[in-house]
């Protein structure tokens, strides 16, 4: 049975607590007052009590009346000790005390679990004066109790610089089951067993659990909370919830979706973020993960040139950050690119293929077979070379850059010449006689200047010398070719 104290005009009937008489203390009052049959008596301080004297339930007034009789100790009367009530019901309880009229300005405050109750609470104090004493009844009401109203309530009265404290009123709120653990959404492997947990508490206990799958009860007999449901395996998505029942009624948990893990959908929106001569930066939007986190992705690259051998380059990368720089590509080439990602179940299909091109690059090799000879009659140096292989030009040849350095008696001077792409020879004027001329040539595309060829040196004698043989790019192993005439 549940005692529910309801609001009513008359004060709450005196209730000796769950154990009749047990809330009456063992001490007896020093002096009885009229209307004080329910008095709580004086608290006699123990000389062995540690710390400061305990300001307890009782104030012992020092004031004496006209007849010089000492005034009695003050204490709250006993009231209900324990109230159990249902959530959302109303409750009213009170403290009462009789105070000699000699005292003025007495105030009663309500406290719950050590904290003063201020503001939005219904606390009413009524005064019933008599010839010698005033009966004070402090009522506290809650119109719709919540679980948070659970607690130990006491009254405090300040009087004569003393604090009088009542015995506690324990308020225990019972209600529908309250979930402490609800089932959680899960992603599971097809046909693999898994567990769901549901736990709810009262009061009142016990709490019984029924499991529900797709709106149908799973267990015919209730299980005591906490309950673990073992599902042997699913082949398709399902929604589970649990019902918690106690004497007050039923609470239903949130419904949770149990998904079946599958291979991911292919990535979408593969796009080119940046292209260089030898790399392409791509990004993609991952497809649906199939209820299982992506582990990694694979970028597939094939040459779009119909004459290519159709081989596919594969680059593996982490699933994040949906960005990858494909390297080691040829310049000025067309590629088809697709992306596929995997989770624990397997690989997705490949995304729609996109076409991408690398840009022109600077040539990767220098012109070949560079030869240099002196044409004294015209006072020129003739230079000849072979253009680099087309594959290694990395773009459309726009010309050549010739570096010629003249060194004589500690003086060194470098000059640069630009030559159009059509020729494979050039003529430069002799700058200094009795000097060494060192020649290097680089191929040029719109992508930049390629590497310079190995240096070829030719000695330019003073005027009047004859017979000039050519100097040429050295065979491997000859580090510093010089034509001596």
């Amino acid at each position: 049975a549940i005692t529910e104290a309801r609001e009513e005009a008359k004060p709450y009937p005196l209730f000796p607590g769950p154990f009749p008489g047990s809330l009456q203390t063992d001490h007896t009052p020093l002096l009885s007052l009229p209307h004080a049959s329910g008095y709580q008596p004086a608290l006699m301080f123990s000389p062995t009590q540690p710390g400061r004297p305990h300001t307890g339930n009782v104030a012992i007034p020092q004031v004496t009346s006209v007849e010089s009789k000492p005034l009695p100790p003050l204490a709250f009367k006993h009231t209900v000790g324990h109230i159990i009530l249902s959530e959302h019901k109303g409750v009213k309880f009170n403290c009462s005390i009789s105070v000699p009229n000699i005292y003025q300005d007495t105030t009663i405050s309500w406290w719950k679990d050590g904290k003063e109750l201020l503001g939005a609470h219904h606390a009413i104090t009524q005064f019933y004066p008599d010839d010698e004493v005033t009966a004070i009844i402090a009522s506290f009401s809650i119109t719709s109790v919540q679980r948070s109203d659970n607690g130990s309530y006491i009254c405090k009265m300040k009087i004569n610089n003393e604090e009088i404290v009542s015995d506690p009123i324990y308020i225990e709120v019972q209600g529908l089951p309250h979930f402490t653990k609800q089932p959680e959404s899960m992603n599971v492997t097809r046909n693999t067993a898994f567990n769901l947990t549901c736990q709810a508490v009262g009061p009142p206990e016990p709490v019984n659990i029924f499991w529900v799958q797709n709106s149908s009860r799973v267990n015919e007999q209730p299980e005591k909370s906490p309950s673990v449901l073992t599902v042997p395996g699913l082949t398709e998505m399902a929604v589970f919830s649990c019902e918690a029942h106690n004497d007050k009624g039923l609470t239903v948990s949130k419904g949770v979706q149990i998904n079946i893990k599958a291979i991911p959908s292919p990535p979408t929106e593969v796009s080119i973020r940046n292209s260089t001569a030898h790399s392409i930066l791509i990004s993609w939007v991952p497809g649906f993960d199939g209820y299982s986190p992506f582990r990694n992705c694979s970028i597939q690259v094939k040459e779009a040139d119909p004459l290519s051998n159709g081989s596919v380059m594969i680059f593996n990368t982490s699933a994040l950050p949906h960005l990858y720089q494909i390297k080691q590509l040829q310049a000025l080439a067309n590629y088809s690119i697709g992306v596929s990602c995997m989770n624990e179940i397997g690989w997705s299909a490949v995304s729609p293929w996109i076409l991408a091109s690398t840009t022109e690059g600077a040539p990767s090799v220098a012109p070949l077979n560079v030869t240099v000879f002196l044409n004294e009659s015209s006072d020129n140096v003739d230079i000849r070379w072979m253009k680099p292989p087309t594959k290694q030009q990395d773009g459309e040849l726009v010309g050549y850059r010739i570096s010629h350095v003249w060194q004589s008696a500690g003086i060194s001077k470098e000059l640069l010449e630009e030559v159009g792409q059509n020729g494979s020879r050039a003529r430069i004027s002799v700058q200094v006689h009795n000097a060494t001329c060192t020649v290097r040539i680089a191929a040029v595309t719109r992508g930049g200047v390629g590497p310079f060829s190995d240096p070829v040196k030719i000695f330019i004698p003073a005027h009047g010398w004859v017979d000039y043989a050519p100097s040429s790019t050295p065979a491997p192993g000859n580090a510093d070719p010089v034509l001596i005439i």
Partner: antibody, heavy 118, light 112 residues
């Protein structure tokens, strides 16, 4: 979380007194009754009495009146029980326990062993 | 005083068995507020008592559903549906309806 920490074991002489402590934490000490219980070796449990620390009110089992004195110090959230005129019959483990909202002794101290021996 | 008579004094069981302990009061434990303040405790060797069931049939927080209580007035029962090794110890009933509070004499649950 609610905890009650009791003082260590005591070895006392017959006729002497002993005071054991019970320090509370994890809840409002002045809002809940503290009860004391005696357990002699290999025997059952006997209720000694309660104190309400909020106002110092006490209630004793008649069998322990004059034997046990219950006090509380709110500044340190500690309840005390003094046992006087000790005899071998008082050799026991003494427990403090909180009377919770459900009106049951829901949390207990670890116990204090008192041995009375000359 | 309300005298609490607990039976049996000793209860040998096999693990997995059901166990039942009885507690009988010399007077009704129903309080004037309609509640019955009869509680069950387990004391494991070398430990303090721990609350299992409060007010006849309510499991205290953290107590497993193997434990259940029933009864009214003067007769009360604690049942353990499937005894496990960790359940061994002494079980006490306690009434707090009447002062002085009184305990049952205890039932020692032990392995057969």
């Amino acid at each position: 979380q609610v905890q009650l920490q009791q003082s260590g074991p005591e070895l006392v002489k017959p006729g002497a007194s002993v005071k054991i402590s019970c320090k509370a934490s994890g809840y409002s000490f002045t809002s809940y009754y503290i009860h004391w219980v005696k357990q002699r070796p290999g025997q059952g449990l006997e209720w000694i009495g309660w104190i309400f620390p909020g106002n110092g009110n006490t209630k004793y089992n008649e069998n322990f009146r004059g034997k046990a004195t219950l006090t509380a110090d709110t500044s340190s959230s500690t309840a005390y029980m003094q046992l006087s005129s000790l005899t071998s019959e008082d050799s026991a483990v003494y427990y403090c326990a909180r009377l919770g909202l459900i009106y049951a002794l829901d949390y207990w101290g670890q116990g204090t062993s008192v041995t009375v021996s000359s | 005083d309300a005298v609490m008579t607990q039976t049996p004094l000793s209860l040998p069981v096999s693990l997995g068995d059901q166990a039942s302990i009885s507690c009988r009061s010399s007077q009704s434990l129903e309080s004037s507020n309609g509640n019955t303040y009869l509680h069950w405790y387990l004391q494991k060797p070398g430990q303090s008592p721990q609350l299992l069931i409060y007010r006849v049939s309510n499991r205290f927080s953290g107590v497993l559903d193997r434990f259940s209580g029933s009864g009214s007035g003067t007769d009360f029962t604690l049942q353990i549906s499937r005894v496990e090794a960790e359940d061994l110890g002494v079980y006490f009933c306690l009434q707090v309806t009447h002062v002085p509070f009184t305990f049952g004499s205890g039932t020692k649950l032990e392995i057969k």
